[in-house]
Interface confidence: medium
């Protein structure tokens, strides 16, 4: 695969991952009440997120309440907020860096310096994934630890929410996408000139017959 194709694939994965991260950050389903006592008919389910908690009645009616005071929040929620928001903002910066370094754009002139820009974009996305992974794993660890803690009442036990799974999928996409972007700019130096005919007229890789694609030339 040419480095331009790797860049496109990497950028698409990073954008999807970024969207997933925003979704995970905003969803109130970081932890959900665990159904452990089957003798009790649970009339409501509690969801907790970084920004609000929601109570879902058995009737389907949902009521959400945004956390009033930042100071009243637990350390892990505050840290998770800071890290996930940082990751989302960093991914936004990484998008512009990656676009500047992409072979299909002309805002930065071609050449080794442009490769460094593209590589920086890929590394930023990798860092975004790692940054987001910290609160997700930390949060999950606390939920699991409390779930198995006998001193925690059954009514206060929670399970991992959908937002955590979305977040993990998002971080995976960000890191795989970041790796592909780095690959396009660094590892695949053997085929770094496979550019877009729309912008450039760099020769494509020789075909099976050993000739260049003549449509690149005017």
């Amino acid at each position: 695969m040419g480095s331009a194709a790797l860049e496109i694939l990497g950028l698409v994965l990073c954008l999807v991952g970024w969207g997933g991260l925003i979704l995970a950050c905003g969803l109130p389903m970081w932890q959900v009440t665990a159904f452990l006592d089957h003798n009790i008919v649970t009339a409501q389910t509690t969801w907790k997120g970084l920004w609000m908690s929601c109570v879902v009645q058995s009737t389907g009616h949902m009521q959400c309440k945004v956390y009033d005071s930042v100071l009243a929040l637990s350390t892990e929620v505050q840290a998770a907020r800071a890290l996930t928001v940082s990751a989302v903002l960093l991914a936004f910066v990484a998008l512009f860096v990656t676009l500047a370094g992409a072979q299909c754009t002309t805002c930065v002139a071609p050449g080794p310096a442009k490769a460094r820009v593209a590589l920086t974009g890929g590394v930023l996305y990798l860092f975004c994934g790692l940054l987001a992974l910290v609160p997700l794993c930390w949060f999950a660890n606390i939920v699991v630890r409390e779930f198995y803690d006998p001193s925690v009442p059954v009514s206060q036990k929670y399970e991992l929410g959908a937002a955590l799974y979305i977040g993990w999928a998002a971080t995976a996409l960000l890191m795989v996408g970041g790796c592909l972007l780095c690959c396009g700019a660094w590892v695949c130096t053997g085929r770094p000139d496979l550019s877009f005919p729309v912008k450039y007229s760099a020769p494509r890789r020789p075909t099976a017959t050993g000739d260049y694609d003549k449509k690149n030339y005017v």
Partner: antibody, heavy 119, light 106 residues
Framework: QVQLKESGPGLVQPSQTLSLTCTVS????????VSWIRQPPGKGLEWMGV???????EYNSTVKSRLSISRDTSKNQVFLKMNSLQTEDSAMFFC?????????????WGQGVMVTVSS | DIVLTQSPATLSVTPGESVSLSCRAS??????IHWYQQKSNESPRLLIR???QSISRIPSRFSGSGSGTDFTLTINGVESEDLSVYYC?????????FGSGTKLEI
């Protein structure tokens, strides 16, 4: 068919300015980059600079202060201007097509023009 | 600047034999090396790009290898028309630089 052809004076006085033209055919300068490379008699090749497809330029630090590369996309021509020439600047000057990409090389070359700096 | 050292400076060969030309970079440059052939009173011609990628219209007897700092251009079965100077060029960093060349004598 891709062709590059250098043209300019064969003899330049010391301290004067050298002006060379590279006329490109078979390629559009809007989609292609062109480099200038020189070769003193009996010596090796030295990359002087490039004008990228987007119009940006990069120069070798050895000649940066004296060199200017420009182009006229309508005429498909690339120009080299180098001032304050000295006798050691005598060389064969080549222009070469440089594929856009992260790690450029030179796949089509002109036949070269010999420039002698002498009084 | 990245310095490319080519060795040997001159290489005497007999037609039909295989030869290897060396190019060493002053720092790691991945596979960002390209090889050129320059015959007497002619402009250089691209032989190999990115250390090992062959070029159309170039005879298959020319091949390249290497990565990092050490690179080799191999000519399998030298022909009399191969009498030339061979240059390596790096594109890992600007300024783009060339090796001093290896002269092949038949």
């Amino acid at each position: 068919q891709v062709q590059l052809k250098e043209s300019g004076p064969g003899l330049v006085q010391p301290s004067q300015t050298l002006s060379l033209t590279c006329t490109v055919s078979g390629l559009s300068l809007i989609r292609n980059s062109v480099s200038w490379i020189r070769q003193p008699p009996g010596k090796g090749l030295e990359w002087m600079g490039v004008i990228w497809s987007n119009g940006g330029t990069e120069y070798n630090s050895t000649v940066k202060s004296r060199l200017s590369i420009s182009r006229d996309t309508s005429k498909n021509q690339v120009f080299l201007k180098m001032n304050s020439l000295q006798t050691e600047d005598s060389a064969m000057f080549f222009c070469a097509r440089t594929p856009d990409g992260y790690y450029p090389y030179f796949d089509y070359w002109g036949q070269g023009v010999m420039v002698t700096v002498s009084s | 600047d990245i310095v490319l050292t080519q060795s040997p400076a001159t290489l005497s060969v007999t037609p039909g034999e295989s030869v290897s030309l060396s190019c060493r970079a002053s720092q790691g440059i991945s596979t960002s090396i390209h090889w050129y052939q320059q015959k007497s009173n002619e402009s250089p011609r691209l032989l190999i790009r990115y250390a090992s990628q062959s070029i159309s219209r170039i005879p298959s007897r020319f091949s390249g290898s290497g990565s990092g700092t050490d690179f080799t251009l191999t000519i399998n079965g030298v022909e009399s028309e191969d009498l030339s100077v061979y240059y390596c060029q790096q594109s890992y960093n600007l300024p783009l630089t060339f090796g001093s060349g290896t002269k092949l004598e038949i």
